[in-house]
């Protein structure tokens, strides 16, 4: 190899000034003995390279590129040979921004999948390979003082969420959690929560169905329907609150809320609808008194309210 | 401290009905499901019933469902088990139990033995 | 209903041993699976619960482990008042049911 670069900083800011030096050997020998050393970025060449000869008789071109607003390039030294640019040595360079801090840090217990699944907003764009890393650790108390560290979780590329498997967790117990983003220019961290893996339990909703009429039961007053909901089995035993949720099918009505209704309630009457309508359903949970995390709505029941009744006229007849 | 006192076991004859009562302290008894587990002499551990916090949920096992009423009354802090139609196989000592939030018993009662016999 | 079925149903082992007890589950239970300690003439006493956690007061030689179908209970170093009969239990959904126990012994 004739020729060698060696720059400043590979990575830099993006805009900051980079500094490059490009040596040629004294022993190729087959080159003019007072080269010019040329400089380009990517496909541009770039003036203002110093050129010097030094004392063991190598060649040094020494360029300051003032502002690298590329966010990826190549820098290569080059010589003239005959009528074409032959390349001694080039590198690679990047500019970019160091993370900023990771930000909206939220987690959520699936007891489901058994599991903390963590998210956060990534911030801008760095234009470098950045790492995030979930962080956590198990503690007595507030999260002042630091217990058992837990594994790192580290997402898939492209990612802002991570998932801590329950043997890592202590349900019960304060926990320490932050995501660290880091690339060549630097790390940042976001601000810590500290949480019991139950307080964000978020349940999956009961299934809602029609209640099966009972031969010694009245039917359905007109505009009215009788519901009933089967919780779901592996949160039963979590005290709940939950709502429903309902709309006319038809039309453009949005939705009308009812609740907060008990879990234990399992069998409800709701009235003041359409009679004769057909209207969609749902219902959702959330762990109460305790905290947690609304479910998501159940998938839809539909169902059809009663005719109104027939009014009777009554008819005087005169003799 | 959180306690729990059964009470009402004792000698029946197939077909008779005993009432067990749990009495709790040390917790906030409204807020919890209770629960009944069984143990027949020499043999393993199985769960009767248990209860929702404030009564609405009462599932049973197969083998009690028609017979067995679990209830409680939170403003005494006690839970019951009404047993009717009782047979020889439900000769065991009877635990009450508090539930955690995933369904675990803890803490137990010392136990009250029934005995189904002629 | 989901059955539980617990491995071996008894074992002899000396204190310092390192004990494994094992549970299945007929159908997946995620980790809604609680290990008790019952000594005779006592109540049963919760030892951990949703599969690994340790239940306040209890020695950190007890640790579960397990998800799905298959659960572990284990006894780092076996102490002389660890003797007892040990049961798994499924929380996922009712009827909430037992595996048969495992009896520890004094070889």
């Known amino acids: 190899e004739c020729g060698h670069i060696s720059v400043s900083a590979p990575i830099v800011h993006l805009g900051d000034p980079i500094t490059a030096s490009c040596i040629i050997k004294q022993n190729c020998s087959h080159l003019d003995p007072e080269p010019q050393i040329l400089w380009r970025l990517g496909a541009e060449l770039q003036p203002g390279g110093r050129q010097q000869r030094l004392s063991d008789g190598t060649q040094e071109s020494i360029i300051t590129l003032p502002h690298l607003n590329h966010t990826q390039a190549f820098l290569s030294c080059a010589l003239n040979w005959g009528n074409s640019l032959q390349i001694l040595d080039q590198v690679e360079l990047r500019a970019g921004y160091p993370p900023a801090i990771p930000h909206n840090l939220s987690c959520l217990m699936n007891l489901t999948t058994s599991s903390l699944i963590c998210q956060w907003e990534p911030g801008p764009e760095t234009h470098l390979p950045t790492s995030f890393t979930l962080k956590s650790f198990k503690s007595r108390g507030n999260c002042q003082t630091q217990g058992d560290s837990i594994l790192d979780c580290v997402p898939k590329d492209g990612q802002s969420h991570c998932s801590i498997p329950a043997k890592h967790l202590l349900l019960y117990q304060n926990m320490g959690i932050w995501v660290q983003a880091e690339n060549a220019l630097g790390t940042s961290m976001s601000p810590q929560l500290c949480l019991d893996p139950m307080d964000v339990v978020k349940l999956e909703p009961p299934m809602l169905r029609t209640m099966d009429p009972s031969p010694e039961a009245a039917p359905p007053q007109a505009g009215c329907l009788q519901l009933s909901w089967e919780p779901w089995q592996p949160g039963l035993h979590i005290n709940q609150k939950c709502e429903l949720r309902h709309k006319p099918q038809r039309g453009e009505a949005s939705w009308a809320l009812v609740g907060p209704l008990p879990l234990e309630a399992l069998q409800y009457e709701l009235c003041g609808l359409l009679p004769a309508t057909a209207y969609t359903l749902q219902i959702r949970c959330i762990r109460w008194p305790l905290p947690g995390h609304w479910s998501d709505w159940s998938p839809s029941l539909e169902l059809r309210t009663t005719e109104r009744a027939p009014t009777h006229h009554h008819h005087h007849h005169h003799h | 401290e959180v306690q729990l006192l059964e009470s009402g076991g004792g000698l029946v004859q197939p077909g008779g009905s005993l009432r067990l009562s749990c009495a709790a302290s040390g917790f906030t008894f409204s807020l919890y499901w209770m629960g009944w587990v069984r143990q027949a002499p020499g043999k393993g551990l199985e769960w009767v019933s248990s209860?929702?916090?404030?009564?609405?949920?009462?599932p049973y096992a197969d083998s009690v469902k028609g017979r067995f009423t679990i209830s409680r009354d939170n403003s005494k802090n006690t839970l019951y088990l009404q047993m009717n139609s009782l047979r020889a196989e439900d000769t065991a000592v009877y635990y009450c139990?508090?539930?955690?939030?995933?369904?675990?018993?803890?803490?137990w009662g010392q136990g009250t033995l029934v005995t189904v016999s002629s | 209903d989901i059955q539980m079925t617990q491995s071996p149903s008894s074992l002899s082992a000396s204190v310092g041993d390192r004990v494994t007890i094992t549970c299945r589950a007929s159908q997946g239970i995620s980790s809604y699976l609680n290990w008790y300690q019952q000594k005779p003439g006592k109540a049963p006493k919760l030892l951990i619960y949703?599969?690994?956690n340790l239940q306040n007061g209890v020695p950190s030689r007890f640790s579960g482990s397990g998800s799905g179908t298959d659960f572990t209970l284990t006894i780092s170093s076996l102490q002389p008042e660890d003797f007892a009969t040990y049961y798994c239990?499924?929380?996922?959904?009712?009827?909430?049911?037992f595996g048969g126990g495992t009896k520890v012994e004094i070889k």
């Open positions: 239990q499924q929380s996922y959904s009712t009827p909430l049911t």
């Open positions: 209860i929702s916090s404030s009564g609405g949920v009462t």
């Open positions: 949703y599969a690994s």
């Open positions: 139990a508090k539930l955690g939030e995933l369904g675990w018993f803890d803490p």
